[in-house]
């Protein structure tokens, strides 16, 4: 606990202190006091540094004092034989005596007391900046006026800091400008810009006075820009050093000005204003800016459009132009989006044919479809070339983005017939020979292909059986032939309307209109066993002269079998319809008279035996196109006949090309369209 | 009406071969296709074979693969079936049977030929 | 090679019974099935194909059902020649395989 005054005494003090001793006093007074120390009696062993016996005064580090011997006072009014004065407010009394005294000493008495201290003066340091007032106990710091006391309460600063400018236009200048400004102050301006404009400092070189760097280069008074992380300066010296103009891309500066206690100089004047932000004239590759400008600044609007091929993707959604916006903190908005090369993705694939990897799916890139030759053609034509256009899709210079369609190529056998040893007036076949044909199991008979979806046969093959069970593909129909044949399966039966229903078929005499069409349920793939046949077409090139020959082929009656195993198929000329007039019906069910001769048919046959017969009906009689020599076409159906192996009578197909087309055309599913 | 005329019974040492031949009649051969079927006795049918006209080419039974040749001979539509190595477990009824068309797997048989395999 | 599980394998029934037989395939065969009819010493006679299709000659009293895996043979009202043994037979592909049989006896 701190006192104002005390005493210290050597050990058995009045009497002789003892040998061997080590004793210390610690004095305090209260903060802000000195310490007078004085001896009144002194009578310590003596030696040379007083290195036996001694009273030694410690002032923190500092050894003030070492008393031995004996002292008497100089002064006959006073008893103080040694004194200190210590302007702190500790210190420290060490007695140390050595093993032996050779006489009797009695030590030392002193007293110590509490002094004021001027702090003002005692010290090196001064400890305020501008005027020191001592009190006993302390001191205290004061200012000149227009100076303020900082926290420190030591120094004394001008109050120049708190000002923000918000204007967008001003003029700011250190204190007393032009006058010296004050020293040992720290003065901060703020610019506080609305968003979206940039504080432009300007300076004039000889508006700037600041107290010159130290050697070392360091700024003893500077002044300083704070732009959120950028700086700009510390800046000092006679005329300003830095750029006469600081665009800080910011719109809030902080102005820093620092001085310390020597050499003030006039200081120094800026002025600022708020500029739009800008914002930079980005390169963006395969693109057109709207507006063109040389600068942009804050709230310019720019709409960036894509050149030809080129699309903006966002997420899944592909655009040809989007919007920027020149922001408050100088960047553009959407800024990441880019022009990129148009996608056209993979190509889609096509029914029948093919497309070849591309290497590439972007603007520019050309594909090429090809159908699977030789079985199917490219019906819309164009060539199959398509190029990724600049709306995204791939296009054909013929049908634009439309797709190529593989259609079967009609008519073409992979292996011509010829004939070789003769059944029923007919030679052994293979499928290859006759591709389009079509095996009905019940009842035993057969059809022709005309295309993917549809199948030509005799009304009276399916007027008993609305859901047949066709093959195709196999020269064989034995049973397991077919079971690896393609089965074909009904989605619609179409009768001829002109075909007369009977309650009992088996007496028919009327075979008119004996043309109907199957409608399948999945469309049929087209390879060298499985291939359609051609219809007629509606000129008169197609209109049969007698003489003209066709084929027929089927597994119908033999003169062996019932049924053939394999396909059959002969090679008949067309006969006046006369000629099949006049053969005798073999088994007649009516009259002769009875039995019914329309233009809608076609009689062949009567050399050498040749024939269709019973389980042939409902195939093609296959005669040559007449305009294009590698292709068959479907001019007669195997309706009826009065004796196998004389005439038979056929469908005459050209008549119902019309009914064909569209029945086809208004039962057709999208696919096909 | 195609008919089958099968050679008769035959009694074999156990490693031996039999040949059993089928005469066809009322077709021929070449618009037919043969098939071999076996029963043991009180055994239910087995399929041992057929010649392939379409394809040119005999298939077996993966079973009697390497034992067992079906030949023909068109010239007096007889068909022939070999079976060698004989066990005493191939003791059964041989039957030719021509296959059916548009879904009926068989047509004809033949009366059946006994093979008994026998030390 | 398609394997064929005929159940039962022995069926007693008397005349005017109602008897069906059922036959599974291992996988699917569509419907090429058939039906055959054994009397002892005599070769099998094809009694239905393609699973339903009833061969000319043969009584309607026989009926065939069903297609891909599962498969019946029904006798509506078994008469005296009807007691023999019957197998169910595929030929989706050349390796016919046929059911082991079942017996129809008198009960």
């Known amino acids: 606990e701190p006192t104002m005054y005390g005493e210290i005494l050597s050990p058995n003090y009045p009497q002789a202190y003892p040998s061997e001793v080590e004793k210390s006093w610690d004095i305090e007074v209260p903060e802000g006091y000195g310490i007078h120390l004085y001896f009144t009696h002194l009578d310590i062993e003596l030696s040379e540094n007083c290195a036996y016996d001694s009273v030694q005064i410690i002032s923190g580090d500092t050894e003030e004092g070492r008393l031995c011997g004996q002292r008497s006072s100089n002064n006959p009014h006073s008893p103080i034989v040694e004194e200190f004065q210590v302007p702190y407010n500790k210190l420290q009394v060490i007695f140390k005596s050595d093993f032996s005294n050779e006489e009797r000493f009695t030590g030392f008495a002193a007293y110590y007391v509490a002094t004021d201290i001027n702090e003002c003066t005692d010290f090196v340091d001064v400890p305020c900046s501008h005027f020191c007032n001592n009190f006993i106990g302390g001191y205290f710091c004061s200012c000149p006026p227009e100076y303020f006391l900082h926290d420190d309460m030591k120094n004394c600063g001008v109050n120049c800091s708190g000002d923000v400018f918000t204007a967008l236009i001003g003029e700011i200048a250190s204190p007393n400008y032009p006058k010296p400004y004050p020293e040992n102050s720290r003065c901060e301006y703020q610019i506080r810009l609305e968003k979206g404009f940039q504080v432009v400092v300007t300076l004039r070189r000889e508006d700037f006075d600041v107290e010159a760097a130290d050697s070392a280069g360091n700024c003893l008074d500077s002044l300083v820009f704070v732009a959120g992380d950028r700086q700009f300066g510390p800046y000092c010296g006679h005329g300003f050093p830095g750029p006469l103009n600081i665009e800080t891309k910011s719109n809030a500066l902080d102005i820093i000005f620092q001085t310390d206690l020597t050499g003030q100089k006039k200081g120094w004047k800026l002025r600022y204003h708020g500029d739009p932000m800008p914002c930079p004239k980005e390169d963006t590759p395969n693109s057109v800016w709207e507006p063109a400008k040389a600068k942009y600044v804050f709230r310019d609007v720019v709409q960036i459009t894509c050149l030809d091929g080129f699309e903006v993707v966002e997420g899944r959604v592909g655009a040809t132009s989007f919007y920027s916006t020149c922001q408050s903190n100088g960047k553009w908005s959407n800024s990441k989006l880019k022009c990129q090369p148009v996608d056209c993705g993979i190509p889609e694939s096509i029914e029948n044919g093919k497309v070849e990897d591309p290497e590439s799916t972007l603007f520019g890139s050309v594909i090429r479809y090809t159908c699977e030759e030789p079985y199917y053609y490219m019906e819309n034509g164009g060539g199959g070339e398509y190029h990724c256009a600049g709306n995204g899709s791939w296009v054909n210079e013929v049908l634009g983005p439309e797709l190529p369609k593989c259609v079967p190529v009609c008519g073409v056998p992979r292996e011509p017939f010829e004939e070789k040893q003769r059944i029923i007036g007919g030679s052994d076949a293979d499928i290859k020979n006759f591709p389009w044909q079509v095996f009905f199991d019940n009842p035993w008979a057969g059809g022709a292909l005309i295309n993917e979806y549809w199948v030509l046969t005799a009304a009276h093959v399916v007027e008993g059986n609305r859901e047949p069970t066709m093959y195709v593909g196999s020269t064989s129909v034995q049973t397991s032939r077919l079971a690896k044949s393609k089965m074909l399966t009904p989605e619609h039966v179409f009768i001829h309307p002109g075909w007369k229903l009977l309650e009992v078929p088996e007496g028919r005499t009327n075979f008119d209109n004996d043309i109907a069409l199957v409608r399948l349920k999945d469309p049929v793939k087209m390879g060298p066993t499985v291939s359609p046949i051609c219809l007629p077409g509606t000129s008169s090139d197609y209109n049969l002269m007698d003489g003209d020959l066709g084929l027929i082929s089927g597994w119908g009656r033999t003169e062996k079998r019932d049924r053939a195993v394999r396909l059959k198929a002969a090679r008949l000329p067309v006969a006046p319809l006369r000629k099949c007039k006049e053969v005798k019906v073999e088994k007649p069910t009516a009259d002769a008279e009875a039995y019914v001769f329309t233009p809608n048919m076609i009689c062949a046959g009567g050399e050498k035996g040749m024939d269709s017969c019973k389980g042939d009906s409902g195939g093609a009689f296959a005669v040559q196109d007449p305009n294009d020599k590698t292709k068959f076409y479907a001019a007669g159906l195997v309706s009826w006949g009065p004796q196998c192996g004389t005439y038979g009578l056929y469908t005459r197909v050209k008549n119902y090309v019309d009914w064909i087309m569209k029945t086809m055309q208004e039962n057709s599913t999208p696919r096909e369209d | 009406e195609v008919q089958l005329v099968q050679s008769g019974a035959e009694v074999k040492k156990p490693g031996a071969s039999v040949k059993v031949s089928c005469k066809v009649s009322?077709?021929?051969?070449?618009?037919?296709?043969m098939h071999w079927v076996r029963q043991a006795p009180g055994k239910g049918l087995e399929w041992m074979g057929t010649?392939?006209?379409?394809?040119?080419?005999?298939i077996y039974a993966q079973k009697f693969q390497g034992r067992v040749t079906m030949t023909e001979d068109t010239s007096t539509d007889t068909a022939y079936m070999e079976l060698s190595s004989l066990r005493s477990e191939d003791t059964a009824v041989y039957y030719c049977?021509?296959?059916?068309?548009?879904?009926?797997?068989?047509?004809?048989w033949g009366q059946g030929t006994l093979v008994t395999v026998s030390s | 090679d398609i394997q064929m599980t005929q159940s039962p394998s022995t069926l007693s029934a008397s005349v005017g019974d109602r008897v069906t037989i059922t036959c599974r395939a291992s996988?699917?065969?569509?419907?090429?099935l058939a039906w055959y009819q054994q009397k002892p010493g005599k070769a099998p006679k094809l009694l239905i194909y393609?699973?339903?299709s009833l061969e000319s000659g043969v009584p309607s009293r026989f009926s065939g059902s069903g297609s891909g895996t599962e498969f019946t043979l029904t006798i509506s009202s078994l008469q005296p020649d009807d007691f023999a043994t019957y197998y169910c037979?595929?030929?989706?592909?050349?390796?016919?395989?046929f059911g082991q049989g079942t017996k129809v006896e008198i009960k």
């Open positions: 049977v021509t296959e059916g068309l548009a879904w009926r797997p068989t047509d004809s």
């Open positions: 009322g077709d021929t051969l070449t618009e037919l296709s």
């Open positions: 010649f392939d006209p379409e394809e040119g080419e005999t």
């Open positions: 996988q699917s065969i569509s419907s090429w």
């Open positions: 393609k699973a339903s």
């Open positions: 037979q595929q030929y989706s592909s050349y390796a016919w395989t």
